[in-house]
Amino acid sequence: MMTGTIETTGNISAEKGGSIILQCHLSSTTAQVTQVNWEQQDQLLAICNADLGWHISPSFKDRVAPGPGLGLTLQSLTVNDTGEYFCIYHTYPDGTYTGRIFLEVLESSVAEHGARFQIP
């Protein structure tokens, strides 16, 4: 029986060009975490395997860094990074747990927004 729960950072926002840490935490179970997959929409970003360590998908190598812990750091954020992210915990003997995070990437600063709408 699956008794565990995934806690996530929930809905988060970050500035364009900056970085953000995606974090999930599995609690209320004694199951062993064998692997954690991180996905964005329909794409696999990275994997942390208990025996093998980290694997970052080649297309994200420049902008994704492993950790801290089982989390994932996204760097050089763009507006296109806005969307849903999923942590997928493969555990033994429980099975698979999933968590969802929604990231909104905002324009760099309020000042920048203000400048854009100034009347000449």
């Epitope: 062993q32 996905e39 794409q43 395997n49 025996d51 999933t98």
Partner: antibody
């Protein structure tokens, strides 16, 4: 060159037991998860069992749980499948397969060993 | 348990044509899906892992894609050596399940 060679297949009566072996070579056996997959006479593929690289974790479908036991001897580079309380529906070609690192796909398969359960 | 529904069960096509085989999962299994090819009298061979990643040595005419719970294997410009059976397989909740298979035959 990666090689997986299965053996131990036979004709056995319903209720009987059989132990299959898979000899691995050409790779570091102790660092890979391994699986048994069978192909039924109607050509369907059925997953039978999986074991983690160190042997700590074993996985089975409900259809064989409690009847089949997967094990490994990393010192001998050998994978095993102990089958008991065999049924006619266990009749199949049994393949051992290696799992891709990080991904749960099976990247190398043996040639298979045939198991027939019939009275 | 998650069910994998593979379609079509069989397909009769000509060399040079493009075909798409699909597997639908009864729940979201994210990228935990692989595709295999099996030729008559041979063992299965992996084509695609993690839904979209081409295995080593697999020709680029093969491609895997995913949209939600639907997974597709596309073969562009079929060659004579591509005829055989194709299977999808998932890993989820500590279980591996194969689709029912698709038999690709020469028209």
């Amino acid at each position: 060159e990666v090689q997986l060679v299965e053996s131990g297949g036979d004709l056995v009566k319903p209720g009987g037991s059989l132990k299959l072996s898979c000899a691995a070579s050409g790779f570091t056996f102790s660092t890979y998860g391994m699986s048994w997959v069978r192909q039924t006479p109607d050509k369907r593929l059925e997953w039978v069992a999986t074991i983690s690289s160190g042997g700590s974790y074993t996985y089975y479908p409900d259809s064989v749980k409690g009847r089949f036991t997967i094990s490994r001897d990393n010192a001998k580079n050998t994978l095993y499948l102990q089958m008991s309380s065999l049924k006619s529906e266990d009749t199949a070609m049994y393949y051992c397969a290696r799992q891709v690192h990080y991904f749960y796909a099976m990247d190398y398969w043996g040639q298979g060993t045939s198991v027939t359960v019939s009275s | 348990d998650i069910q994998m529904t593979q379609s079509p069960a069989s397909l009769s096509v000509s060399v040079g044509e493009t075909v798409t085989i699909t597997c639908r999962a009864s729940e979201n299994i994210y990228s935990n899906l692989a595709w295999y090819q099996q030729k008559q009298g041979k063992s299965p061979q992996v084509l695609v892992y993690a839904a979209t990643n081409l295995a080593d040595g697999v020709p680029s005419r093969f491609s895997g894609s995913r949209s939600g719970t639907q997974y597709s294997l596309k073969i562009n410009s079929l060659q004579s050596e591509d005829f055989g059976s194709y299977y999808c397989q998932h890993f989820w909740d500590n279980a591996y399940t194969f689709g029912g298979g698709t038999k690709l035959e020469i028209k």
